[in-house]
Interface confidence: low
C-alpha cells in the first residue's frame, strides 16, 4: 500500500471540523500580473503581497501595481495600494525587506524615461506607512541593507555609480564611479570592483578591488588584476589574473583584504569559473570548473585559513549554461551536504557527505521502494535526489529538497530509486536521520513544507488540474490525512509559510478561472487546534545524531564531537511552539588521524590515514609554493579539520619542515596596496 495508508495509521480525531474553523479565504478582486509575497520581520505575522510587472510592458493593459498587507499570517488582507500612490513596482527589484526585525521595506518604482532618477517607497514600521523618495540616480540593482545597520543602504546606478545612504534611503551620495560589483562586508565595510578603461565587461580581469570602512570617506585599493570577488563566512575571495597568461587564480584574505594568500587551488582559464558553494566561519566548499564545456568540475574543501584545499568530490555537476548545481546544505543535521555528479556515461547520480565533504557516498535505497529501469541490478540501487538541475530541465519536480535547522534530522526531497536520476515522474522521500535512511513519503510530485519545527508536514499534489485538497502528517510523514479546504478547486500556484518553520499557519495560493475572469485567492489554514496541547518532557526522546551503532565508543563522532538531541516522538501530537529551541548535548571525541587534513606539500596515500610529504611539487602545488606566503610553507604536515573539536587521542606532532626551501616569491606586492581619500 502507499505510505501512510496503513490501517494502524494514527489518525487525528475530528480534524476536519478543527481545520474548517481555522481556514480563512481571501479573494483578491483586482490582482493582475505576477504576484510576489514577502514576510516582514520574524514572528510578526506581517505579509506583503505585491503585483509587479516586467519593464518594458504595455502597462495600460493591466492598470497599476497592487499592494496588500496582512498582519495575521495571511488570514486577512488589506489593500494598501494608496500608500504607494498607485505606482508601478518593478519585478526585478521586488520588495527589499530589511534584516532581522528592523521592520524596514523598500519598494523600487518604475518611472517614466525622461526623469532625472528613480523612485522608492520606504517603510520602517512593518509596511504600515510608506514615504515616497525620488532618487538622484536610476537604480541598476535592488537596495542592499548593511547587515549591521539597516539604516545604511547601498545601490548601483545604471551609470555604474556606487551610491550610499546613511538614513534609510532619505538622502543619497555617490561615493564612487565606474563600479561593477559591490557587497557589504562585516562592520559596515563595503567591497567593490572598479574599471579604469571602458566598462565592466571590457576590463574583466583588469578590475581593481576597493574597500571603504567609513561609508565612502576614504578608500583602499586591496587588489589589482581582479576578475571577480566574493564573500563567504569570514573569507574574502578574489579571482586574480596571472601575470603570464589568461588564467586566473583564487586569492583569499581573512582580514578584510589587508593581506592576501594564494589559495592552493588549480588556476582556471577564460571559459572556466570558480564558485563558492558554501562557506561558514570555519571553512569553505569551492567548486572549480573543468576545462571545456563539460558541465562538471571538482569540489575542494578548505582548511581554517581558506588556503590549503583537499579534493572532496570529482565530476561535480555544475552546468555552465544555466549555472545550475544541486549542491544542498542539509541544515537539519550538522556536516551533511547533498549534490549530484555527472558519471562517465553522462547519467546524473546523487552523492551525500555526512562529514562536511570528507567522504561522499550514494544515498541508501529506501526500504519501501523498488529499483527502477535505470538499475542494472534490481536488488542494488540508490536514491537519487532531484534538485535545481532537474527543475531547470523542466522535469516534473515542483520543489527542491527541504530541511530546517529546528526540525532536526528531517530532509524531504523528490527522487527516484535506481542507478541514476530518472526522467520519470518522481516520488517524494523523507529522511528522519539527516540523510542516512530514507522512506517513500508520497506517491508522485508534491509541494511540501514543514510547520511547528517538524511537528507537522504539509503537502499538496503537483497537478495541472485545479485542486482543493491538502495533506498533512503529524508523525514525520509516516501517516497522512487529507483535508478539503474549499468546495471550488483552484489552480494552485504556491504554498507560503513563514520562514523558519516555526509557524502553524500555511497559505495556499492560486487562482480561479471562469469564462471571462480569473481571480487570485489565498486560503490560510491554522493547525493550532490539530496540535491541541503544548509538548511536555514525555513527548521527547533522546536521539544520537550520525549514530548507527550506539554501542560503538566512536560512533556518531563527526568533526571531533557527537551530539544527542531531544526530538519529538513520532506518536506525540502536540505543539513544539514558536519558542521551541533545539536541545542538544555534545560530547567531545578522542582525536584520530581522520580529524586532521594534510597540510600543503603533504598527501594521503590510498588507504592510509597518515600524511606523507610530496616528493616533488608539481602543477598548482608548485605555483602555490612559488607565490604562497612564507608562513604557510612552514608545516608539520597536519592541520586540524576546520570546526573539528576532538580532544586527546592522536596528536600527530612531528618535525616542522620549511617547504620554502623548495621555492620562493610572493603575491600582492606592497606597492600595489595604495590608499587614498575622497
Amino acid at each position: 500500500s502507499a505510505p501512510g495508508e496503513d490501517e494502524e495509521c494514527g489518525r487525528v480525531r475530528d480534524f476536519v471540523a478543527k481545520l474548517a474553523n481555522n481556514t480563512h479565504q481571501h479573494v483578491f478582486d483586482d490582482l493582475r500580473g505576477s504576484v510576489s509575497l514577502s514576510w516582514v520581520g520574524d514572528s510578526t505575522g506581517v505579509i506583503l503581497v505585491l503585483t509587479t510587472f516586467h519593464v518594458p510592458l504595455v502597462i495600460m493593459t493591466f492598470g497599476q501595481s497592487k499592494l496588500y498587507r496582512s498582519e495575521d499570517y495571511g488570514k486577512n488582507f488589506k489593500d494598501i495600494t494608496d500608500l504607494i500612490n498607485n505606482t508601478f513596482i518593478r519585478t526585478e527589484f521586488g520588495m527589499a525587506i530589511g534584516p532581522e526585525n528592523s521592520g524596514k521595506v523598500v519598494l523600487t518604482a518604475e518611472v517614466s524615461g525622461g526623469s532625472r532618477g528613480g523612485r522608492i517607497f520606504r517603510s520602517s514600521d512593518f509596511a504600515k506607512n510608506f514615504v515616497q523618495t525620488d532618487l538622484p540616480f536610476h537604480p541598476l540593482t535592488q537596495m542592499m541593507y548593511s547587515p549591521q545597520n539597516s539604516d545604511y543602504l547601498l545601490a548601483l546606478s545604471t551609470e555604474n555609480g556606487l551610491w550610499v545612504s546613511k538614513n534609510f534611503g532619505g538622502k543619497w551620495e555617490e561615493i564612487h564611479k565606474a563600479v561593477c560589483l559591490a557587497k557589504w562586508g562585516s562592520d559596515n565595510t563595503i567591497f567593490f570592483t572598479t574599471y579604469a578603461n571602458g566598462s565592466c565587461k571590457a576590463d574583466l580581469g583588469a578590475l581593481e578591488l576597493w574597500r571603504t570602512s567609513d561609508l565612502g570617506k576614504s578608500f583602499k585599493t586591496i587588489g589589482v588584476k581582479i576578475y571577480s570577488f566574493g564573500l563567504g563566512g569570514r573569507f574574502l575571495f578574489a579571482s586574480v589574473m596571472a601575470d603570464k597568461d589568461t588564467t586566473r587564480r583564487i586569492h583569499v584574505s581573512t582580514d578584510q583584504g589587508d593581506t592576501w594568500s594564494m589559495a592552493q587551488l588549480p588556476s582556471v582559464g577564460q571559459e572556466q569559473f570558480y564558485s563558492i558553494l558554501a562557506a561558514n566561519d570555519d571553512m569553505v566548499f569551492m567548486h572549480v570548473d573543468e576545462p571545456g564545456d563539460t558541465g562538471f568540475g571538482t569540489i575542494f574543501t578548505s582548511d581554517d585559513r581558506g588556503i590549503v584545499y583537499s579534493k572532496s568530490l570529482d565530476r561535480h555537476l555544475y552546468t555552465t549554461t544555466g549555472g545550475e548545481t544541486d549542491f544542498t546544505n542539509v541544515t537539519s543535521l550538522r556536516g551533511v551536504y547533498i549534490t549530484s555528479v555527472l558519471s562517465e556515461d553522462n547519467s546524473i547520480q546523487t552523492m551525500i557527505t555526512f562529514d562536511q565533504g570528507g567522504r561522499w557516498t550514494h544515498l541508501r535505497k529506501p526500504e519501501n521502494s523498488e529499483c527502477d529501469a535505470t538499475a542494472k541490478n534490481k536488488n542494488e540501487c540508490s536514491l537519487h535526489i532531484h534538485a535545481s538541475y532537474s527543475i531547470s530541465q523542466k522535469l516534473n519536480v515542483p520543489m527542491a529538497p527541504l530541511s530546517e535547522p529546528n526540525a532536526v534530522g528531517i530532509v524531504i526531497a523528490h527522487g527516484s530509486v535506481g542507478d541514476a536520476i530518472s526522467v520519470m515522474v518522481p516520488d517524494v522521500y523523507i529522511s528522519d536521520d539527516g540523510g542516512y535512511s530514507w522512506t517513500k513519503m508520497l506517491e508522485g510530485p508534491h509541494y511540501y513544507t514543514i510547520l511547528d519545527s517538524g511537528g507537522i508536514i504539509v503537502a499538496i499534489e503537483h497537478s495541472s488540474r485545479p485542486i482543493n485538497v491538502i495533506k498533512f502528517s503529524t508523525d514525520e510523514g509516516q501517516c497522512w490525512q487529507t483535508y478539503t479546504f474549499t468546495r471550488d478547486p483552484i489552480y494552485f500556484t504556491g504554498l507560503a509559510s513563514e520562514p523558519g518553520a516555526r509557524s502553524m499557519n500555511i497559505s495556499i495560493w492560486g487562482f480561479t478561472e471562469s469564462f471571462l475572469t480569473s481571480q487570485w485567492v489565498s486560503y490560510t489554514i491554522d493547525f493550532k487546534d490539530i496540535l491541541e496541547r503544548n509538548c511536555e518532557e514525555k513527548d521527547y526522546t533522546i536521539w544520537a545524531a550520525h549514530s548507527t551503532d550506539p554501542e560503538d565508543y566512536e560512533d556518531g563522532c563527526i568533526l571531533g564531537y557527537k551530539e544527542q538531541f531531544l526530538r519529538l516522538r513520532k506518536s506525540s501530537v502536540c505543539q513544539n511552539g514558536r519558542d521551541y529551541v533545539v536541545t542538544k548535548q555534545p560530547s567531545i571525541c578522542l582525536c584520530s588521524l581522520e580529524d586532521f587534513l594534510c597540510d600543503f606539500g603533504y598527501y594521503r596515500p590510498e588507504n592510509d590515514s597518515k600524511c606523507v610529504e610530496q616528493p616533488e611539487l608539481k602543477g598548482h602545488d608548485l605555483e602555490f609554493c612559488l607565490y604562497g606566503r612564507e608562513e604557510h610553507l612552514t608545516t608539520n604536515g597536519y592541520r586540524k579539520i576546520p570546526g573539528d573539536k576532538c580532544q586527546g587521542g592522536v596528536n600527530p606532532v612531528r618535525e616542522v619542515k620549511d617547504l620554502k626551501k623548495k621555492c620562493t616569491s610572493n603575491f600582492l606586492s606592497p606597492e600595489k596596496q595604495n590608499s587614498k581619500s575622497n
Partner: antibody, heavy 124, light 107 residues
C-alpha cells in the same frame, strides 16, 4: 558484575615476547575502549595504549611503538596485549583497564574498571 | 608529552585530617584530569574524572577541583581505608600521562 580477569604471571627471557589476555564480563565488550597500563616495581603508572574493541583501531604510546600489539577477540570478549623484544626494564605489573564511557558531556576518558594485573618478569 | 607533576610525593596524616594533593600539568589540559587511588598489590581505582566529577560508588569526602594546569584532590576527613598512593592522569592529549604519585601514610 563488571569485571576484567587477566592471565597469570609470566617469566620471560630478554628478547622474547609476552602476550597478556584480559577477559571482560558483565558489560558490552565492544562498547568501551580497553587501555593497557603498566607499573614497574616501586614505580608509578605508565600508559601503553588502547584498542577500540568494536573497530580494532589502536593507539600506542610512542615509547612502545613497534614493540606492542593490541588485539581483541570479540567472540570471547577478550583483549590481548603482546610486547616483543623484551628487556629487563619491561619487568612490571601489566593492567588492562576499561575506558570510562563518554555518554553525554565529555568525561575525560578516565579508566573506571581495572583488571587484577599480570606480573611479567624479564630475566636471563 | 605532557608532564604531570604531583606534590607532595608523600605525606603523613592522621584519621580525620583534611588532606590536599596537587597536580600540575606542563601545559593546559582544560579539565581533562582524573584521580586514582592505589593500595599495595592492588589495581588502581578511579575516584574523580573530568577534574571534579565523583565516580559512582566513591565516598563524597573525596573531591576534585581545578582546570587548565593546576588541579587539587581533597579528602575532607581522612579515614583509615584512605591510606594509599594517589595518582593524577591527563587525557587531553595523547599519550595519556600519569603523575608520579602521592603516598598518604599514617602519622
Amino acid at each position: 558484575q563488571v569485571q576484567l580477569v587477566q592471565s597469570g604471571a609470566e617469566v620471560k627471557k630478554p628478547g622474547a615476547s609476552v602476550k597478556v589476555s584480559c577477559k571482560a564480563s558483565g558489560y558490552t565488550f565492544v562498547a568501551y575502549y580497553m587501555h593497557w597500563v603498566r607499573q614497574a616495581p616501586g614505580q608509578g603508572l605508565e600508559w601503553m595504549g588502547w584498542i577500540n574493541p568494536n573497530s580494532g583501531a589502536t593507539r600506542y604510546a610512542q615509547k612502545f611503538q613497534g614493540r606492542v600489539t593490541m588485539t581483541r577477540d570479540t567472540s570471547i570478549s577478550t583483549a590481548y596485549m603482546e610486547l616483543s623484544r623484551l628487556r629487563s626494564d619491561d619487568t612490571a605489573v601489566y593492567y588492562c583497564a576499561r575506558g570510562k564511557r563518554s555518554s553525554g558531556w565529555y568525561e575525560g576518558y578516565g579508566m573506571d574498571v581495572w583488571g587484577q594485573g599480570t606480573t611479567v618478569t624479564v630475566s636471563s | 608529552d605532557i608532564q604531570m607533576t604531583q606534590s607532595p610525593s608523600s605525606l603523613s596524616a592522621s584519621v580525620g585530617d583534611r588532606v590536599t594533593i596537587t597536580c600540575r600539568a606542563s601545559q593546559s589540559i582544560s579539565s581533562y584530569l582524573n584521580w586514582y587511588q592505589q593500595k599495595p598489590g592492588k589495581a588502581p581505582k578511579l575516584l574523580i574524572y573530568a577534574a571534579s566529577s565523583l565516580q559512582s560508588g566513591v565516598p563524597s569526602r573525596f573531591s576534585g577541583s581545578g582546570s587548565g594546569t593546576d588541579f587539587t584532590l581533597t579528602i575532607s576527613s581522612l579515614q583509615p581505608e584512605d591510606f594509599a598512593t594517589y595518582y593524577c592522569q591527563q587525557s587531553d592529549v595523547s599519550p595519556i600521562t600519569f603523575g608520579g604519585g602521592t603516598k598518604v601514610e599514617i602519622k
